[in-house]
């Protein structure tokens, strides 16, 4: 069971990143699915290595004081959403903006029907060029 | 099937990074090989988690305007070279140069005879000290 | 065999990061254990994908000239400690400090009783908020 999906620019104002089965994507079988273009949902309980990579372009003067944060989050059936992993990068002083990449990854126990998704502080700063921003998992 | 190879400084002017089976490297068996010191080639079709880490040292004034980009690329038999993953980091203002690390990783379907390699915008900026820059894969 | 442990602030002056089985941690069975809150120790020989993520907050003026370096290290029975992976990030000019995240990961052969741990140049700069700093492995 494995998946690798590709970022998709979105007109939505949500902080949850959008993904698509496009380009050199992976969706091994129907035991993992991409739901609503925003979350990877698994049908089998078990240990999964889950990862996300986010490339963004920001400028210190044009951004809020707070850093750019990418969060890998979990929604299990009958449970509240929770953060699994976070990474933070301070905005660049480069103009018009400076690109930076964040990589998150870890091993987590998922229940049947559990969904994982990626949140960012400012989706408008995310880079969607080939290979820059992606999201995936593999069952151990 | 798994491999982990270590960066090697090169006098070549190519943007493709060079690797060696040295230090604490891994080469599980002959179903994955390091070819010409530049690419990992697999003999078996399947899903692979492929990763690379690149540490580099650069300075904004001494570098081009463009960020430092590391790309994980694929060459499959009978197909053309393509990008799987990219990461970008804007150059540091630290002098003489500021070190930064990039990590790439994802799950991809590889065909028999497929090769993966790592491209960077400026190989002369790459750090080759122990553990700083490496490249590997594992078959799921 | 898999583990994922969560960073723990420590009053110790050691450069070795401290970890705990807390939050959304993983410890699949007793073939991998967290020893002294500082190292993951495996009982079985084999290939492991080992990873660490470290988020830190530093300022160029308040830090040494040297970059922030995170190292993944190995101690095998009857062998000296050695570095497996390192990543480096130059300190930010943001005030009071600028957050940055480092991700390390690779495939390594471990012997029975081998331990892996994470060293950083300045543990006081490490961020311990939910999901920011973690450490884990999985047996292939």
């Amino acid at each position: 069971i494995a998946a690798h999906v590709i970022s998709e620019a979105s007109s939505k104002t949500t902080s949850v990143l959008q993904w698509a089965e496009k380009g050199y994507y992976t969706m091994s079988n129907n035991l993992v699915t991409l739901e609503n273009g925003k979350q990877l949902t698994v049908k089998r309980q078990g240990l999964y290595y889950i990862y996300a990579q986010v490339t963004f372009c920001s400028n210190r003067e044009a951004s809020s004081q707070a850093p750019f944060i990418a969060s890998l989050c979990l929604k299990s059936p009958g449970r509240f959403e929770r953060i699994l992993l976070r990474a933070a990068n301070t905005h660049s002083s480069a103009k018009p903006c400076g690109q930076q990449s964040i990589h998150l990854g870890g091993v987590f126990e998922l229940q049947p029907g559990a969904s994982v998704f990626v949140n960012v502080t400012d989706p408008s700063q995310v880079s969607h060029g080939t290979g820059f921003t992606s999201f995936g998992l593999l069952k151990l | 099937i798994a491999a982990h190879v270590i960066s090697e400084a090169s006098s070549k002017t190519t943007s493709v990074l060079q690797w060696a089976e040295k230090g604490y490297y891994t080469m599980s068996n002959n179903l994955v090989t390091l070819e010409n010191g530049k690419q990992l080639t697999v003999k078996r079709q399947g899903l692979y988690y492929i990763y690379a880490q690149v540490t580099f040292c650069s300075n904004r004034e001494a570098s081009s305007q463009a960020p430092f980009i590391a790309s994980l690329c694929l060459k499959s038999p009978g197909r053309f070279e393509r990008i799987l993953l990219r990461a970008a980091n804007t150059h540091s203002s630290a002098k003489p140069c500021g070190q930064q690390s990039i990590h790439l990783g994802g799950v991809f379907e590889l065909q028999p005879g497929a090769s993966v390699f790592v491209n960077v915008t400026d190989p002369s900026q790459v750090s080759h000290g122990t553990g700083f820059t490496s490249f590997g894969l594992l078959k799921l | 065999i898999a583990a994922h442990v969560i960073s723990e602030a420590s009053s110790k002056t050691t450069s070795v990061l401290q970890w705990a089985e807390k939050g959304y941690y993983t410890m699949s069975n007793n073939l991998v254990t967290l020893e002294n809150g500082k190292q993951l120790t495996v009982k079985r020989q084999g290939l492991y994908y080992i990873y660490a993520q470290v988020t830190f907050c530093s300022n160029r003026e308040a830090s040494s000239q040297a970059p922030f370096i995170a190292s993944l290290c190995l101690k095998s029975p009857g062998r000296f400690e050695r570095i497996l992976l390192r990543a480096a990030n130059t300190h930010s000019s943001a005030k009071p400090c600028g957050q940055q995240s480092i991700h390390l990961g690779g495939v390594f052969e471990l012997q029975p009783g081998a331990s892996v741990f994470v060293n950083v140049t300045d543990p006081s700069q490490v961020s311990h908020g939910t999901g920011f700093t973690s450490f884990g492995l999985l047996k292939l």
């Epitope: 380009g23 050199y24 969607h128 060029g129 | 463009a66 980009i69 053309f80 393509r82 990219r86 | -």
Partner: nanobody, 116 residues
Framework: EVQLLESGGGLVQPGGSLRLSCAAS????????MAWVRQAPGKGLEWVST????????YYADSVKGRFTISRDNSKNTLYLQMNSLRAEDTAVYYC?????????WGQGTLVTVSS
Amino acid sequence: EVQLLESGGGLVQPGGSLRLSCAASGFTFARYQMAWVRQAPGKGLEWVSTISDDGDSTYYADSVKGRFTISRDNSKNTLYLQMNSLRAEDTAVYYCAKLDKLFDYWGQGTLVTVSS
């Protein structure tokens, strides 16, 4: 239906320059990596260059590095190959290619002949 129409080929002397164009239609051009490949008389297809969808990353075969430049204009759905310092061994039919997951699509090609 994917269509790729190459143009700009011709006869040129060694050391000369040419600019090839490839007009793309039938797909969302800006979402795909693109490449130039070539086939010399009596030889197999040879990869020349690849460009990312955003144009930020470019890759070249060692044989053309420093002489050829790949670029794209996503607003015009067009791929380009600027070829300088041409050599006799660059003589070939040049094809532009759309890089998809399962297949690489390419056009009819344009002939480049380098001869004095």
